[in-house]
Interface confidence: low
């Protein structure tokens, strides 16, 4: 629809209160340096503004795009060159270039301090001296450091971090209610923000055509009796929506993410008997359900899919009539008969049997050279299911910690040239896939395993991106997004590595290690471990084990000692000459 | 801000009926629960029933499960409480109010807006 107003349309669509909370949204993801207030300023200034329009939509300005309005309102921050630097620049360029510039200076990483939580009565009383404030906050702090957080979720996590504050604020132990809920939020929240950010990078990087095929494969699994028509409009709709939101257009994602889920709830006859309760929530639980909601059951008798694409004359006669629709149909007709696989299984199914028809279709006898094409899926089936295997056995021999360990290992050894924190950070993830996924039966290990690794995979790849430092790394992240995992899997040792220079302050601990959490205490050994690694590349695993026994028994040791400091100075040298012997430093 | 109107009240016999309506001033986006409350005189305000932005789910206090019925529209943006059978005690000031869609629908804390309410009489 044409609207005089797009920013008096949106206002209305949304209501006040989630307008401002969605451009305070969009705005921290762009400038995410900005103070808490500095960001106020301009959304309350954004709001009076977007009423005038209500009020009038032939005001001056109302017809202009809400790009134009919101580039021109962060345009206006006093101290843009000096904290921002070049994309100070973004501001010379009309529309759309200048969204486009400040999307590429969106950053994954930005050097932000770690956020503290506070006591739990400071916490409480915050909340209740200006809730509207404390919210706002939360908003600003988690849409600054996740700068593509898919806003329409954000504000279910806000509402649900109201939630517990409200409750827990007047029981009896607060911290008792309050913590496991911050923590659970914080954990889902950094899941989420992860999963949004490799749709992002899937349209981003990839296309619209990508994320489509995901969405097709992932939506047939979600609803195997849909029709393949309902599937499309869906995938459609929700590609829209993500494309928005991707591109910082907040406003409207949230709208339209508003009326798919209406959709959904309003058909959900022909798409889906799990929706019914998801159905009966309030809006932004209603969407975050459907979004998670289970599989359906699948239709019983679904003929072999051989017959329509394989063994019928009329093959190549399809394809060549319409290759992406045809393509769907496979994917969408193979992903229902297949809640078993991972998307990206399922995809490099797809891919392969494409290039199966693009070769076979241009022979002399087309159905000759395509007849074994399913026989070719086999090996790609096959693969994952073996990696699953062994690394669910190897998890459950070691527990996650020392899953996370031999992963780091692993991955230091395969790109040791990546900074140590990005090599803790991705292989701690990409081990919590054990106490995630192994934990299922076989029909839902792979489709849990595969289709988190890429999640994590990709935080690699954009982390990496900012600061490219291995060819291996960009080679495996650009080439293919449904192969980063194998590509992943199968890179070796990198014999050109040049081992680091050992610096024994990289290996010199203090008492503040005994007052930390487990968790922080879990990553300093960690990044210790990715260290002599990168020191010792050849090092065996009885190696790097002997030498990790020893520190965390040199850790408990310190720890119980009266004069903890001394102990860590003194035992410290004595661990260091160790270790470098036994490594052959 | 979501303002939100009642409508409705008024003095009534023991056994007879009322139709209360509860208009938002706009659509709430992320306010999808709309509940009745009330203030009988000298007590606090209770939980008389909700209904979701759907109008699937409602709920009702055990006082009055049987005899009020929750409804809505939402092309006018309007709840309503529709209460027969009624009883010298059902006397009191209701409210609607809109929550913000995070469980709980019993309590007040969680509800965003409120209305200024209408007042309901009961006469033996």
């Known amino acids: 629809d044409a609207h005089k107003s797009e920013v008096a349309h949106r206002f209305k669509d949304l209501g006040e209160e989630n307008f401002k909370a969605l451009v305070l949204i969009a705005f921290a993801q762009y400038l995410q340096q900005c103070p808490f207030e500095d960001h106020v300023k301009l959304v309350n200034e954004v709001t009076e503004f977007a009423k005038t329009c209500v009020a009038d939509e032939s005001a001056e300005n109302c017809d202009k795009s809400l790009h134009t309005l919101f580039g021109d309102k962060l345009c206006t921050v006093a101290t843009l060159r000096e904290t921002y630097g070049e994309m100070a620049d973004c501001c010379a360029k009309q529309e759309p270039e200048r969204n486009e510039c400040f999307l590429q200076h969106k950053d994954d990483n930005p050097n932000l301090p770690r956020l503290v939580r506070p006591e739990v009565d400071v916490m409480c009383t915050a909340f209740h001296d200006n809730e509207e404030t404390f919210l706002k906050k939360y908003l600003y702090e988690i849409a600054r450091r996740h700068p593509y957080f898919y806003a329409p979720e954000l504000l279910f996590f806000a509402k649900r971090y109201k939630a517990a504050f409200t409750e827990c604020c007047q029981a009896a132990d607060k911290a008792a209610c309050l913590l496991p809920k911050l923590d659970e939020l914080r954990d889902e929240g950094k899941a989420s923000s992860a999963k949004q950010r490799l749709k992002c990078a899937s349209l981003q990087k990839f296309g619209e055509r990508a994320f489509k095929a995901w969405a097709v494969a992932r939506l047939s699994q979600r609803f195997p009796k849909a029709e393949f028509a309902e599937v499309s409009k869906l995938v459609t709709d929700l590609t829209k929506v993500h494309t928005e939101c991707c591109h910082g257009d907040l406003l409207e994602c949230a709208d339209d993410r508003a009326d798919l889920a209406k959709y959904i709830c309003e058909n959900q006859d022909s798409i889906s008997s799990k929706l019914k309760e998801c159905c009966e929530k309030p809006l932004l639980e209603k969407s975050h359900c459907i979004a998670e909601v289970e599989n359906d059951e699948m239709p019983a008798d679904l003929p072999s899919l051989a017959a329509d694409f394989v063994e019928s004359k009329d093959v190549c006669k399809n394809y060549a009539e319409a290759k992406d629709v045809f393509l769907g149909m496979f994917l969408y007709e193979y992903a229902r008969r297949h809640p078993d696989y991972s998307v990206v299984l399922l995809l490099r199914l797809a891919k392969t049997y494409e290039t199966t028809l693009e070769k076979c279709c241009a022979a002399a006898d087309p159905h000759e050279c395509y007849a074994k094409v399913f026989d070719e899926f086999k090996p790609l089936v096959e693969e994952p299911q073996n990696l699953i295997k062994q690394n669910c056995e190897l998890f459950e021999q070691l527990g996650e910690y020392k899953f996370q360990n031999a992963l780091l290992v692993r991955y230091t050894k395969k790109v040791p040239q990546v900074s140590t924190p990005t090599l803790v950070e991705v292989s701690r993830n990409l081990g919590k896939v054990g106490s995630k996924c192994c934990k299922h039966p076989e029909a839902k290990r792979m489709p849990c395993a595969e289709d988190y690794l890429s999640v994590v995979l990709n935080q690699l790849c954009v982390l990496h991106e900012k600061t490219p430092v291995s060819d291996r790394v960009t080679k495996c992240c650009t080439e293919s997004l449904v192969n980063r995992r194998p590509c992943f899997s199968a890179l070796e040792v990198d014999e050109t590595y040049v081992p680091k220079e050992f610096n024994a302050e990289t290996f010199t601990f203090h008492a503040d290690i005994c007052t930390l959490s487990e968790k922080e205490r879990q990553i300093k050994k960690q990044t210790a471990l990715v260290e002599l690694v990168k020191h010792k590349p050849k090092a065996t695993k009885e190696q790097l084990k002997a030498v990790m026994d020893d520190f965390a028994a040199f850790v408990e040791k310190c720890c119980k000692a009266d004069d903890k400091e001394t102990c860590f100075a003194e035992e410290g040298k004595k661990l260091v000459a160790a270790s470098q012997a036994a490594l052959g430093l | 801000e979501v303002q939100l109107v009642e409508s409705g009240g008024g003095l009534v016999q023991a056994g007879d009926s009322l139709r209360l309506s509860c208009t938002a001033s706009e659509r709430p986006f992320m306010s999808y629960v709309m509940g009745w409350f009330r203030r009988a005189p000298g007590k606090d305000r209770e939980f008389v029933g909700a209904?979701?932005?759907?109008?699937?789910?409602?709920w009702y206090s055990d006082s009055v499960l049987g005899r009020f019925t929750i409804s809505r529209d939402n092309a006018k943006n309007t709840v309503y409480l529709q209460m027969n059978s009624l009883k010298p005690e059902d006397t009191a000031v209701y409210y609607c109010a809109v929550a913000d869609g995070v469980g709980l629908y019993r309590y007040e804390r969680q509800y965003d807006y409120w209305g200024q309410g209408t007042q309901v009489t009961v006469s033996s």
């Open positions: 209904i979701t932005w759907s109008g699937i789910n409602t």
